[in-house]
Amino acid sequence: RKIPKVGHTFFQKPESCPPVPGGSMKLDIGIINENQRVSMSRNIESRSTSPWNYTVTWDPNRYPSEVVQAQCRNLGCINAQGKEDISMNSVPIQQETLVVRRKHQGCSVSFQLEKVLVTVGCTCVTPVIHHVQ
Amino acid sequence: GITIPRNPGCPNSEDKNFPRTVMVNLNIHNRNTNTNPKRSSDYYNRSTSPWNLHRNEDPERYPSVIWEAKCRHLGCINADGNVDYHMNSVPIQQEILVLRREPPHCPNSFRLEKILVSVGCTCVTPIVHHVA
């Protein structure tokens, strides 16, 4: 999948654009909003009716190297009595993000953008049952 | 920066950390092509904390379209299909990395940007603080 080129109708390529070799793009990995922090409601992963745990995955050849993945704790959902309701399903909610992958080929190094699917948390859903004849 | 294990036979000139600016291939390595959550899952309707999806479009960003979730109710849907206000629907937020055209309007020059998106909603037990 390629980054879409800027449409001629909307943009005029400014003179200030840096020269870039064909088939590649220049990427500054100094992150804008680097210090932005998620202000999620307090420990919703434990208070949810579809609670989840977090696991940190670490890869030194990826930027950012740390990616946090959520896993639903239960198959069902927690009811008002604190018991698992097995007629409901805890399901993972996922979101795509971009990472930069560093690849070593012999002594040369190349960089590749990659889409990564992150499990963000879980939600409780009513199951759908299909009877296949 | 990030320390990279170096091939011991390689010249020692290479920086162990990710450089500030890199040249990357225009092709994104990606198996997850379905970026429209309306098509990829129907959770937003079936959840006990359902949400609506709003399209956020910005041609200076890649991906240019990001879907934002907004919880439909303050409470959660109970077994009878009614809103139970003893429970709370809350957004699940996630920081994601996107590409921002920099300088603006340039076709092949980008900078990574961290943005906060609401991905969906989950139903939680409210915390009640009694202030004397």
């Epitope: 239960n74 198959l75 399903n89 399901v91 993972p92 859903v125 009513t126 199951p127 759908v128 049952i129 299909h130 009877h131 296949v132 | 899952s41 129907d42 959770y43 079936r46």
Partner: nanobody, 118 residues
Framework: EVQLVESGGGLVQPGGSLRLSCAAS????????MAWVRQAPGKGLEWVSS????????NYADSVKGRFTISRDNAKNTLHLQMNSLKPEDTALYYC???????????GGQGTQVTVSS
Amino acid sequence: EVQLVESGGGLVQPGGSLRLSCAASGFTFSSYRMAWVRQAPGKGLEWVSSTSTGGEMTNYADSVKGRFTISRDNAKNTLHLQMNSLKPEDTALYYCAAGTSAGHWSTGGQGTQVTVSS
């Protein structure tokens, strides 16, 4: 396409045991949650038990907890339900179901009849 064939049902006295099996084909068994659901005469479907893709998570309806045990063999694409201390109220048609992580379930078999009676 999901294909599920249940077996192992029968007539048993109260307090007796049965082991139900479900042979699965047509899909990647190890990627699906699996479950047993049952339907008593004149009643709706009831979730009995389910298991995660690797079998490390299981859950049970309160009515069968401590008596029934669900298990899966991913190498053989088979799901089992060990039913002990059976009661007359366990009488039902038992179906095996395959579910995606998104909570979409398929039941494909004819079910297997379990009758608990003296």
